[in-house]
Structure formats: structure tokens, C-alpha cells
Amino acid sequence: TVPPMVNVTRSEASEGNITVTCRASSFYPRNIILTWRQDGVSLSHDTQQWGDVLPDGNGTYQTWVATRICRGEAQRFTCYMEHSGNHSTHPVPS
């Protein structure tokens, strides 16, 4: 088992909004849960966009999940990762 490296980034979207992206890379096996939480509960699936789980060329995998949020509410969002029985949560950077 190779645990993922998780990285959260933010980028400007439309006025007052940002897109937050959570990337997991260099993990094996390929089964992974990567999702955004808002206010500590699941963010609905229709407000998230997922990338495919793809090989990254080193025998490991990568994927991502993104959502668009209000800039001033970033504190309320965390990216949740679960892989091979391990869990972690990752805040949006300031």
C-alpha cells in the first residue's frame, strides 16, 4: 500500500467565488474516496466534479475533486480522503 499525497488548492472563479480542488496522487491501490465536506457533512454529489482515477506512470494513481464556493466561506469546507483504511481531512488554504 502506498498512501496518497493530498494537496488542496484554490483559484479564482466568477466574482466572489473560488474553485477549490483537492488532488490525491502517488497512491496504490487505486480504490480511494475523495470528497468535499461542508459544515462537517457530505457536500452533495451534484455540486462536486471528480476526475478519473488515472495511472501516474510510477505504478501508482492520481485523481481530484473540485467544487465552487463563496470566497468568504472557505473555512467551512474540508477535503476528506480515505484510502486503505486510513483517513485524513484537508482544509482550504488561506
Partner: antibody, heavy 119, light 107 residues
Amino acid sequence: DVQLQESGPGLVKPSQSLSLTCTVTGYSITSDYAWNWIRQFPRNKLEWMGYINYSGTTNYNPSLKSRISITRDTSKNQFFLQLISVTTEDTATYYCSYYRYDGAWFPYWGQGTLVTVSA
Amino acid sequence: DIQMTQSPASLSASVGETVTITCRASGNIHNYLAWYQQKQGKSPQLLVYNAIMLADGVPSRFSASGSGTQYSLKINSLQPEDFGSYYCQHFWSFPLTFGAGTKVEIK
């Protein structure tokens, strides 16, 4: 460490309002987190009532939505519960708690305060 | 709303025994589950979050598992301080709801 302490009257008459205070020490309620009220009925059933978060946004249990209000006083680092038109069914131990945004579980609770609704 | 059904409602066990408490959700909660222990006259205390993760300071004789709608809390070699009530709570969506509790008593 975050510490929470509930206070308020232990006896309320039916049809009146129940008002409780949660005083938070060790952390500013405007810095982060969701600040919650949870109650436990005499037969031990637990019910999440709602929260006010660090920015003042509230979220209530729909079963209580028409009767509940959660507010705060940031200068005193306190948040409040008001429940209107109470009945004997609102007799319970009321707890304040908080959760972080990594997940809505409750790491610490106040000691609880028993409120009896009775004429 | 997601309803949480706990079983058994109560159980009697001896010190040293292994006990298992189960919690069933009315819908898939995707491991968004916590467990609490409550002693008589005290506030609930967090034991487990994210379905399987032990909270800080929780002894390793406690373990939790599950997925989808079915979850369990296991206590190996029950100790005197483990007697009390146990509650599950989901945090998949609002409103947050709790199970009705399981009371663990001394046989």
C-alpha cells in the same frame, strides 16, 4: 482546551420560552467551528437541535425550526438557545458542544443543564 | 432524515468479556459515523469518528467497523470503567441524528 458551560433556569412553565446560555472558554467562537445545542430527553434519547457557526450562520433541526433560535454575544464569547412555546415534551438535559469542519462529530460537551417544563 | 437503529437496547456482560454493539442507518451514510460513551449523570464522550477512527485517549480494546448502512462497535476484554451507555451518530447530512443507545450493564 475548549471548555463549555451551560447555564439557565431549571424550571420553565408550559407555553413560555426556554432560554439557555453556553459560555465558551479557551477558544473564540468567532475563530472557527460550529457551536451546537443538543438535548437528551428523560429516557435518554439524544436530539441535535442546531448550531451557530463562527461567522454567525445558523442551521436548525427542521423538527424545531419554527420554535428555535440560536444567537451569540461575541464580546462575552457566549452563544444562546431560545425555544418558544415549550411543552412538557421539552423537558430534557440541554448540552452545548461544538464540532470542527473536518466532520460533524462532537469532541467535547458541556456538563449539561436539566430543564423541567412544568406548571 | 436518516434514522439510526441501535441494537441491542441493553446487554449484561462480565468483566473480561467481548461485547459488540451495532448501529443501522436508514440510508447509506458512507462511514460518516461517530460513537459516544456516556456514564450515568455525565456528558457523552467521543469514542470513534469516521466510523473506525479512535478518538484521542480511547483505549485500544475499543474497535469499530462497518460501511454503507451497517456499523459496529466492539469492546474486547470489558473493563469496569466501560459500563454505561453507548450511542451512534451519523453526520452524512442534516439533521444529525443519534441512535437510541445501548446500555451495557454488569452481569
